[in-house]
Amino acid sequence: EPPTACREKQYLINSQCCSLCQPGQKLVSDCTEFTETECLPCGESEFLDTWNRETHCHQHKYCDPNLGLRVQQKGTSETDTICTCEEGWHCTSEACESCVLHRSCSPGFGVKQIATGVSDTICEPCPVGFFSNVSSAFEKCHPWTSCETKDLVVQQAGTNKTDVVCGPQDRLR
């Protein structure tokens, strides 16, 4: 009796179970009553990453330098090329089809997490006791200067954008 279902890595065709082509190869001809499935390797710049019965291999992704992309990992016959962004840029999506410049954190905000090739800068407001007076993609919030440890006193209070200003203590005559 002809099968109605096949094992893993097989497919049903013409009432018989044929082996799927292994990753890196495409289907040329179905198996016959005499022979196994006929498969061929994917060409240069092509890949298939699963056991399959595909008649065409997929083209490797192109990392377009005009979009700020570069190759992070070269593709093989079994894997696609992985793109990432040039220094200072990050991917706009998980598929990394284009890049945008890392965002900078404005004064009053510091960098919580530095950007990577796939994620943007994460900023956080500087809490009380901390400040940032620059727009930067790297600088964290800095703590206010401690006047006391320098035997000085606060002459001007700090904000989230400015440091405290220290000055000498008034001498009692």
């Epitope: 001809s29 016959t32 022979t35 061929l40 008649t55």
Partner: antibody, heavy 116, light 111 residues
Framework: QVQLVQSGGGLVQPGGSLRLSCAAS????????MSWVRQAPGKGLEWVAN????????YYVDSVKGRFTISRDNAKNSLYLQLNSLRAEDTAEYYC?????????WGQGTLVTVSS | QSALTQPASVSGSPGQSITISCTGT?????????VSWYQQHPGKAPKLIIY???NRPSGVSNRFSGSKSANTASLTISGLQAEDEADYYC??????????FGGGTELTVLG
């Protein structure tokens, strides 16, 4: 069962044209590469051409490039070989075969004779 | 696209073993495990007897076996029988996505 039934051979003058056909049955024609192989009288086998499942890939032996065209009609389960600008050295038995590079099934063959 | 090189003829007595060689290049035989062997009796279409270097189609006698070393493939027929008398052809897939056959070997079974 698998069958490949050929037609279209015959006698043709040098420079003439001919179209060979191969009607397939007993298998899923559209998921298989197909090929043509020829054999001159008293000589060995010579691979001529093959075509992929949807006709987007076609390959030919150098000696027939630009003169022969392989094609297929998946709706009709048929394979074709158009022979143009025929030469005496194209005289041979032409076989269609199922597959891209190995052939478990062959047509019965059709004789093409190029002679004036 | 040069034909693969096979001996023009080989012979052997019934019961003996014979080997037919098939020599190509690194762009065909040596580069892929896609070597096939065909048996052809006079006036008949070829019959596949070995594929992918070593695989035997179901129904083909286990007296037929295939192997490959570098750019040379071989077909061995053991326990030679009268019905083995035929022409034998090797073929190989090539780096230019084409196929090439050997020139053929005529096998004579003596006696």
């Amino acid at each position: 069962q698998v069958q490949l039934v050929q037609s279209g051979g015959g006698l043709v003058q040098p420079g003439g044209s001919l179209r060979l056909s191969c009607a397939a049955s007993g298998f899923t024609f559209s998921s298989n590469w197909m090929s043509w192989v020829r054999q001159a009288p008293g000589k060995g086998l010579e691979w001529v051409a093959n075509i992929n499942q949807d006709g987007s890939e076609k390959y030919y032996v150098d000696s027939v490039k630009g003169r022969f065209t392989i094609s297929r009609d998946n709706a009709k389960n048929s394979l074709y070989l158009q022979l143009n600008s025929l030469r005496a050295e194209d005289t041979a038995e032409y076989y269609c075969a199922r597959g891209g590079y190995r052939y478990a099934y062959w047509g019965q063959g059709t004789l093409v004779t190029v002679s004036s | 696209q040069s034909a693969l090189t096979q001996p023009a003829s080989v012979s052997g007595s019934p019961g003996q073993s014979i080997t037919i060689s098939c020599t190509g290049t690194s762009s065909d035989v040596g580069g892929y495990n896609y070597v096939s062997w065909y048996q052809q009796h006079p006036g008949k279409a070829p019959k596949l007897i070995i594929y992918d270097v070593t695989n035997r189609p179901s129904g083909v006698s286990n007296r037929f076996s295939g192997s490959k070393s570098a750019n040379t493939a071989s077909l061995t027929i053991s326990g030679l029988q009268a019905e083995d008398e035929a022409d034998y052809y090797c073929s190989s897939y090539t780096s230019s996505s084409t196929l090439v056959f050997g020139g053929g070997t005529e096998l004579t079974v003596l006696g």
